[in-house]
């Protein structure tokens, strides 16, 4: 299922980097979230629970990330013009069933004021 454009502010700039916000519904308990740049997987985070309700959080493609009860934030640093692209949050919902995949995204525009280490 492709949801299309994110209906929230997906990119938050600070200190020459960007926080990319990938939201998911509060009811989702177990999932995989991938950050795609174009068609390439940049980062991922998987949250699962065992039979004793213990939480496991894994990253195969590691980026600095932050998990909350309804979002995963991925952080990209040292921005330059090559970072300008379409970015997508690819959410695979394991729990609650049924299994479902949603894709939301937007275009990351890079302006001079947002670049790290500008030459004066």
């Amino acid at each position: 299922e492709i949801n299309g454009s994110a209906n929230y502010e997906m990119f938050i700039f600070h200190n020459g980097g960007v926080q990319i916000l990938c939201k998911y519904p509060d009811i989702v308990q177990q999932f995989k979230m991938q950050l795609l740049k174009g068609g390439q997987i940049l980062c991922d985070l998987t949250k699962t629970k065992g039979s004793g309700n213990t939480v496991s959080i894994k990253s195969l493609k590691f980026c600095h990330s932050q998990l909350s009860n309804n979002s995963v934030s991925f952080f990209l640093y040292n921005l330059d013009h090559s970072h300008a692209n379409y970015y997508f949050c690819n959410l695979s919902i394991f729990d609650p069933p049924p299994f479902k995949v949603t894709l939301t995204g937007g275009y990351l525009h890079i302006y001079e004021s947002q670049l790290c280490c500008q030459l004066k």
Epitope: Q29, T48, G50, G52, N53
Partner: antibody, heavy 117, light 111 residues
Framework: EVQLVESGGGLVQPGGSLRLSCAAS????????MDWVRQAPGKGLVWVSN????????EYSPFVKGRFTISRDNAKNTLYLQMNSLRAEDTAVYYC??????????WGQGTLVTVSS | DIVMTQSPDSLAVSLGERATINCKSS??????????LTWYQQKPGQPPKLLIF???TRQTGVPDRFSGSGSGTDFTLTISSLQAEDVAVYYC?????????FGPGTKVDIK
């Protein structure tokens, strides 16, 4: 089709050791938590242990903690249970089970462990 | 540890009649909007089979004569019209916390 096949059971003396194996196929083994559940003859089901997808988290029933060790080899799609200091009350059929996110959705046929002198 | 109890220990029901099994937990299994309660069926000489998860959601392929209900600490498995192939032991199970525990089981036979 998900398949779980246990092996390694048998007769062992009290105080002895045994290593059970569970060969998994038909799914991406490294994506799932896995568990061991046992059933004494004519009795009910008792959870023994679980392990997360890459083996970094393991949990144990109070009955076996300190004596049993669960592990997995994702390259071989195999789950293990190392059982030491076995007691007569550990006699049971041991089932390997896949934790399918919110329930045990697949079970092996079980392997019988008998602890007796 | 959460203690699971089941009643009755066994029951015999005529073919086509309703069978009702109760399960009680020593503390609430409700977290958010989910009850962490599962039902399994075990036929003689076979491993358990998943019937119902989250207290009331039928596993794919399970006949609709099986239904689960309840919330918090009190749960029920109902077989609306017992068939010969339903002769088995039925277990409730919680995964609210560690260690997960099973009820002692309820044996269902044909009267």
């Amino acid at each position: 089709e998900v398949q779980l096949v246990e092996s390694g059971g048998g007769l062992v003396q009290p105080g002895g050791s045994l290593r059970l194996s569970c060969a998994a196929s038909g799914f991406t083994f490294s994506d799932y938590w896995m568990d061991w559940v046992r059933q004494a003859p004519g009795k009910g089901l008792v959870w023994v242990s679980n392990i997360d997808e890459d083996g970094s988290i393991a949990e144990y029933s109070p009955f076996v903690k300190g004596r049993f060790t669960i592990s997995r080899d994702n390259a071989k799609n195999t789950l293990y249970l190392q059982m030491n200091s076995l007691r007569a009350e550990d006699t049971a059929v041991y089932y390997c089970s896949r934790w399918g996110r919110f329930a045990f959705d697949s079970w092996g046929q079980g392997t019988l462990v008998t602890v007796s002198s | 540890d959460i203690v699971m109890t089941q009643s009755p220990d066994s029951l015999a029901v005529s073919l086509g009649e309703r069978a009702t099994i109760n399960c009680k937990s020593s503390q609430s299994l409700l977290s958010g909007s989910f009850n962490y309660l599962t039902w399994y069926q075990q036929k003689p000489g076979q491993p358990p089979k998943l019937l119902i998860f989250y207290a009331s959601t039928r596993q794919t392929g399970v006949p609709d004569r099986f239904s689960g209900s309840g919330s918090g600490t009190d749960f029920t498995l109902t077989i609306s019209s017992l068939q010969a192939e339903d002769v088995a032991v039925y277990y409730c199970h919680h995964h609210y916390n560690a260690p997960p525990t099973f009820g002692p089981g309820t044996k269902v036979d044909i009267k």
